[in-house]
Interface confidence: low
């Protein structure tokens, strides 16, 4: 079972805590570790047996406004001869992240946290074969 | 949501940048989607570059549980089910945003934090360096 929301009994912990209106929370979007870099192996998206392309989605009312999504290039996987082997499957690997969504309502704006599913890359898997009786 | 008055020029003027600090609604849109990769698919076992999932738990973060992938082999699994060292299993990494309590003891004050997670593994042709 889930407790949805505790009545709006918002409790302040130390005196130094910022006052926050009921039903909301204060979010600093200056990102901790903003400058860390992904040190992935070089162009694995092209060298993979399940290669993928990247598409950048851009939304000015989302923070961050750029989200990169991967798409598998093939249904099958690339074999040692560089040909597509359809006895194997290229499948997307996905990961959730948080974004902040800005919503305009007339002359007011509100902010909402949102979970977004990002396709990160692809991997080659043995297919699940369903036998029909 | 929590409404905040727009700038005085509304509706003509539009602030393109996000403010440094915002008040956000406590409800997270899509917050109940499945976050356990073991339950959502068995790709980690069926992949030619299989991986194990390790639980990274931090109660002062949201989400408090993040699953980290670690490739099981240096090579990839071939058609015979053996490890082929002519190919490499490599992690696919992704930067994600999480919430961190800041200041640490305040119940409703947070900061976004970028963390690097290994989401899964993929099988790649190795880069061969020829020594002159």
């Amino acid at each position: 079972r889930k407790i949805p929301k505790v009545g709006h009994t918002f409790f302040q912990k130390p005196e130094s805590c910022p006052p926050v209106p009921g039903g909301s929370m204060k979010l600093d979007i200056g990102i901790i570790n903003e400058n860390q870099r992904v040190s992935m192996s070089r162009n694995i998206e092209s060298r993979s047996t399940s290669p993928w392309n990247y598409t950048v989605t851009w939304d000015p009312n989302r923070y961050p406004s750029e989200v990169v999504q991967a798409q598998c290039r093939n249904l099958g996987c690339i074999n040692a001869q560089g040909k597509e082997d359809i006895s194997m499957n290229s499948v997307p690997i996905q990961q959730e992240t948080l974004v902040v969504r800005r919503k305009h309502q007339g002359c007011s704006v509100s902010f909402q946290l949102e979970k977004v599913l990002v396709t990160v890359g692809c991997t080659c898997v043995t297919p699940v074969i369903h036998h029909v009786q | 949501g929590i409404t905040i008055p727009r700038n005085p020029g509304c509706p003509n003027s539009e602030d393109k940048n996000f403010p440094r600090t915002v008040m956000v609604n406590l409800n997270i849109h899509n917050r109940n989607t499945n976050t356990n990769p073991k339950r959502s698919s068995d790709y980690y076992n069926r992949s030619t570059s299989p991986w194990n999932l390790h639980r990274n738990e931090d109660p002062e973060r949201y989400p408090s549980v993040i699953w980290e992938a670690k490739c099981r082999h240096l090579g990839c699994i071939n058609a015979d089910g053996n490890v082929d060292y002519h190919m490499n299993s490599v992690p696919i990494q992704q930067e994600i945003l999480v919430l961190r309590r800041e200041p640490p003891h305040c119940p409703n004050s947070f900061r976004l934090e970028k963390i690097l997670v290994s989401v899964g593994c993929t099988c790649v042709t190795p880069i061969v360096h020829h020594v002159a």
């Epitope: 079972r1 889930k2 407790i3 949805p4 929301k5 505790v6 009994t9 918002f10 929370m25 | 406590l26 997270i28 738990e57 109660p59 002062e60 973060r61 949201y62 989400p63 408090s64 919430l99 309590r101 003891h105 119940p107 409703n108």
Partner: nanobody, 119 residues
Framework: EVQLVESGGGLVQPGGSLRLSCAAS????????MYWVRQAPGKGLEWVAE????????YYVDSVKGRFTISRDNAKNSLYLQMNGLRAEDTAVYYC????????????WGQGTLVTVSS
């Protein structure tokens, strides 16, 4: 699977005492702040108390300060609420809750134990 089982509720006279217990299993108990939350008849949920992972810090809603004490035993995976000087307005179902850090969203909670304060 995460489980939280409360016990110790009952009927008590005003000014009396009760000790609630919560047995936790299925997660790393010592890694989480734990909470007591209550729901009075016909009312919404009210946060009562929180205790940090190592038990070093406790927080209380104003109406119970000085009367209630939250404690925990990490070796036993147990959470407690010692309730003294009980008043009629403390009558409620008391829940123990394990929470994500997002305030007021508890991802797991028990079935509750009823505390009735009446003469």
């Amino acid at each position: 699977e995460v489980q939280l089982v409360e016990s110790g509720g009952g009927l008590v006279q005003p000014g009396g005492s009760l000790r609630l217990s919560c047995a936790a299993s299925g997660f790393t108990f010592s890694s989480y702040s734990m909470y007591w939350v209550r729901q009075a008849p016909g009312k919404g949920l009210e946060w009562v108390a929180e205790i940090k992972q190592d038990g070093s810090e406790q927080y209380y809603v104003d109406s119970v300060k000085g009367r209630f004490t939250i404690s925990r035993d990490n070796a036993k995976n147990s959470l407690y609420l010692q309730m003294n000087g009980l008043r009629a307005e403390d009558t409620a179902v008391y829940y123990c809750a394990k929470g994500e850090i997002l305030p007021l969203y508890f991802d797991y909670w028990g079935q509750g134990t009823l505390v009735t304060v009446s003469s």
